[in-house]
């Protein structure tokens, strides 16, 4: 018969022959022949291969270097790489997560719209009229101005995006 020019899925062409690829978690030891199947071996400890492959070497699991502020989010298996994340208060610089960035705080006049995670920074928003933030924080939202009326008081000093209103007693008119 004619030698194949293309092979089925999960096969590869070698020496005019279709051989089975090694399954994820295994590496190639020897190609198949007319008489033998492809020989594969499981990846060693701290190694992985995540696709059907003909690799002769497994990849090393990523090392989450604590010196860089990294820690293991998900331990690698023979079929998956280790996933790193950053220690509390920091987030990954990029998707590859090879280093960490300190979470940003929202300055006075701004509140936290979205708290930072291991992969994203704090998102801040300006405090709208009627709200304020007088601290630099990675957690605090804008707070509403105090309602003087509900306390039977009047506004003595108007609020800003950075300060609360100041309430005071009402001037009582004498008869």
């Amino acid at each position: 018969p004619e030698p194949p020019t293309a092979c089925r899925e999960k096969q590869y062409l070698i020496n005019s022959q279709c051989c089975s690829l090694c399954q994820p978690g295994q590496k190639l030891v020897s190609d198949c022949t007319e008489f033998t199947e492809t020989e594969c071996l499981p990846c060693g400890e701290s190694e992985f291969l995540d696709t059907w492959n003909r690799e002769t070497h497994c990849h090393q699991h990523k090392y989450c270097d604590p010196n860089l502020g990294l820690r293991v989010q998900q331990k690698g298996t023979s079929e998956t790489d280790t996933i790193c994340t950053c220690e509390e208060g920091w987030h990954c610089t990029s998707e590859a997560c090879e280093s960490c960035v300190l979470h940003r705080s929202c300055s006075p006049g701004f509140g936290v719209k979205q708290i930072a995670t291991g992969v994203s920074d704090t998102i801040c928003e300006p405090c709208p009229v009627g709200f304020f933030s007088n601290v630099s924080s990675a957690f605090e939202k804008c707070h509403p101005w105090t309602s003087c009326e509900t306390k039977d008081l009047v506004v003595q000093q108007a609020g800003t995006n950075k300060t609360d209103v100041v309430c005071g007693p009402q001037d009582r008119l004498r008869a």
Epitope: D65, N67, L68, E88, T93, S94, S99, V101, S105
Partner: antibody, heavy 116, light 112 residues
Framework: EVQLVQSGAEVKKPGSSVKVSCKAS????????MHWVRQAPGQGLEWIGY????????NYNQKFKDRATLTADKSTSTAYMELSSLRSEDTAVYYC?????????WGQGTTVTVSS | DIVMTQSPLSLPVTPGEPASISCRSS???????????LYWYLQKPGQSPQLLIY???TLASGVPDRFSGSGSGTDFTLKISRVEAEDVGVYYC?????????FGQGTKLEIK
């Protein structure tokens, strides 16, 4: 080998702008933030801010927020620091520094002189 | 902003003798994650700064073990067990607990 190579010295007039470059090599540019620190003559170190080349997201010291612009060009692995409305107090050596587990690599520094 | 205060500002030392530099922060640099975000840098004459110690007490790669860092949340010390001529320069402490990152004024170590 990680290297940060900065552009040459600049002499500028008050009120003008300066743009300093920092070319990175020897590592994946988008995996680390690039910070900028300055040092006035005979003075200490002052942090300006950083750029995250992965997201193009800058974070500034409030003191420089209105005058500094930090950018990064992924295609050339180069970070830039532009400072506008220059005044004599901006005369300093400007450094770029990579943040790994600290400022583990620094550029050689760029001297910016502001003089009329 | 967190204020970093170093002392002394000038430190003349005889080679072979120990040296100690103090750094105080206006706020505790101990994070709830257990790390203390205090760093020490040395700027030798005419050079860019270089890292000595990170996270208060960990020696950076390639730094001689005569250098050591210690401290609590707000009070920190850089010690050199036996000063050598190559140790001259300005030593800076820096906090990276929150933005803006801030440095101490620097301590100039010189040989007597």
């Amino acid at each position: 080998e990680v290297q940060l190579v900065q552009s040459g010295a600049e002499v500028k007039k008050p009120g003008s702008s300066v743009k300093v470059s920092c070319k990175a090599s020897g590592y994946t540019f988008t995996s680390y933030t690039m910070h900028w620190v300055r040092q006035a003559p005979g003075q200490g170190l002052e942090w300006i801010g950083y750029i995250n080349p992965s997201s193009d997201y800058p974070n500034y010291n409030q003191k420089f927020k209105d005058r500094a612009t930090l950018t990064a060009d992924k295609s050339t692995s180069t970070a830039y620091m532009e400072l506008s409305s220059l005044r004599s107090e901006d005369t300093a050596v400007y450094y770029c520094a990579r943040w790994g587990y600290s400022f583990d690599y620094w550029g050689q520094g760029t001297t910016v002189t502001v003089s009329s | 902003d967190i204020v970093m205060t170093q002392s002394p500002l000038s430190l003349p030392v005889t080679p072979g003798e120990p040296a100690s530099i103090s750094c105080r922060s206006s706020k505790s640099l101990l994070h709830s994650n257990g790390n203390t975000y205090l760093y020490w840098y040395l700027q030798k004459p005419g050079q860019s700064p270089q890292l000595l110690i990170y996270r208060m007490s960990t020696l950076a790669s390639g730094v001689p073990d005569r250098f050591s860092g210690s401290g609590s949340g707000t009070d920190f010390t850089l010690k050199i067990s036996r000063v050598e001529a190559e140790d001259v320069g300005v030593y800076y402490c820096m906090q990276h607990l929150e933005y803006p990152l801030t440095f101490g004024q620097g301590t100039k170590l010189e040989i007597k």
